[in-house]
């Protein structure tokens, strides 16, 4: 499986909300011994590997932001901790998962990574990630709403193991 990032750049004004999105692309095994762990974190563009370092998003670590699935494969980080920080991550039945950040500030600017780990009994734990940039702007040059820039097909499809 792969992870696609529909948008590689989000440019938003201060105070706006934004939803960063990743998409899990098949073939995805839905067998009962397979679990998908999905999460979000901030990182930096390393010389060798993007998304290698895992930094918190608004003081919440990737452990705090991971999506835990109920019986129907849709999921969200329903715990109050994330919402108190103006964050909410969610996923649907179609492989899309996202993190919503409310009331953006300049400090939210940076590189964001989504991570998916496929967990199977006695198999290697396949990891893939997607990366996207968030630029929060203020002043007269800032857009009135968030502007999103699509990833090139190469960027969104050619995702390496994290």
């Amino acid at each position: 499986f792969k992870v696609a990032t529909p948008y590689s750049l989000y440019v938003c004004p201060e105070g706006q909300n934004v939803t960063l999105t990743c998409r899990l692309l098949g073939p995805v095994d839905k067998g009962h011994d397979v679990t998908f762990y999905k999460t979000w974190y901030r990182s930096s563009r390393g010389e060798v590997q993007t998304c290698s370092e895992r930094r918190p998003i608004r003081n919440l670590t990737f452990q705090d932001l991971h999506l835990h699935h109920g019986g129907h494969q849709a999921a969200n980080t329903s715990h109050d901790l994330a919402q108190r920080h103006g964050l909410e991550s969610a996923s649907d039945h179609h492989g899309n998962f996202s993190i919503t950040m409310r009331n953006l500030t300049l400090l939210d600017s940076g590189l964001y990574c989504c991570l998916v780990v496929e967990i199977r009994h006695h198999h290697s734990e396949h990891r893939v990630h997607g990366a996207m940039e968030l630029q929060v702007q203020t002043g007269k040059d800032a857009p009135s709403n968030c502007v999103v820039y699509p990833s090139s097909s190469q960027d969104s499809e050619n995702i390496t193991a994290a």
Epitope: Y37, S52, F62, H66, H68, I119, H123, S124
Partner: antibody, heavy 118, light 107 residues
Framework: EVQLLESGGGLVQPGGSLRLSCAAS????????MSWVRQAPGKGLEWVSR????????DYSPSFQDRFTISRDNSKNTLYLQMNSLRAEDTAVYYC???????????WGQGTLVTVSS | EIVLTQSPGTLSLSPGERATLSCQAS??????LNWYQQKPGQAPRLLIY???NRATGIPDRFSGSGSGTDFTLTISRLEPEDFAVYYC?????????FGQGTKVEIK
Amino acid sequence: EVQLLESGGGLVQPGGSLRLSCAASGFTFSTAWMSWVRQAPGKGLEWVSRVNPSDSHTDYSPSFQDRFTISRDNSKNTLYLQMNSLRAEDTAVYYCARVPPGYGFDIWGQGTLVTVSS
Amino acid sequence: EIVLTQSPGTLSLSPGERATLSCQASQDITNYLNWYQQKPGQAPRLLIYDASNRATGIPDRFSGSGSGTDFTLTISRLEPEDFAVYYCQQSYSTPFTFGQGTKVEIK
């Protein structure tokens, strides 16, 4: 403060059983993947088992698959390890640890000593 | 099961010196390797994850490198509190496995 506190260790005869507990605090236990790791006296670390947040997915090291059972009670923020048919070579300090997928064991308890001897 | 072999078994060094610890995997594990420090009577502590990233609160004198089958933990200048046993561990597949450890002792 993030904390894991093991209990239930002690002296048990060969062939006996023991149930270890690990009480979690300071983080959201109900969404955490958890593990047991053991360390025989003067020896290295050995992974025993892992369980997902909903208790529906468990993994074991082949050495423990038939004798040990990992479980959890999210309402009590507690992780368990049921150990049966204990042998002298199971004598070790047993640690519980949080282990997010695709990461290392990032939170550890202080360990509880299990001694199997007649 | 993936076997991790650490070398040397013991490293005798003085404070201020550089320590280089090695971990070799029996198969390619990409960069899914973690390093831990353990002091006598204490639980292990995560130092490095994914071969080269310092865990929260770990001083920058600790660094990790490598990928595939060969990995290195470097302590640039040993402090008195760094004398301990160090373990590598792979998170590539279950069963998760640890190396046998390298003891860094005061010379």
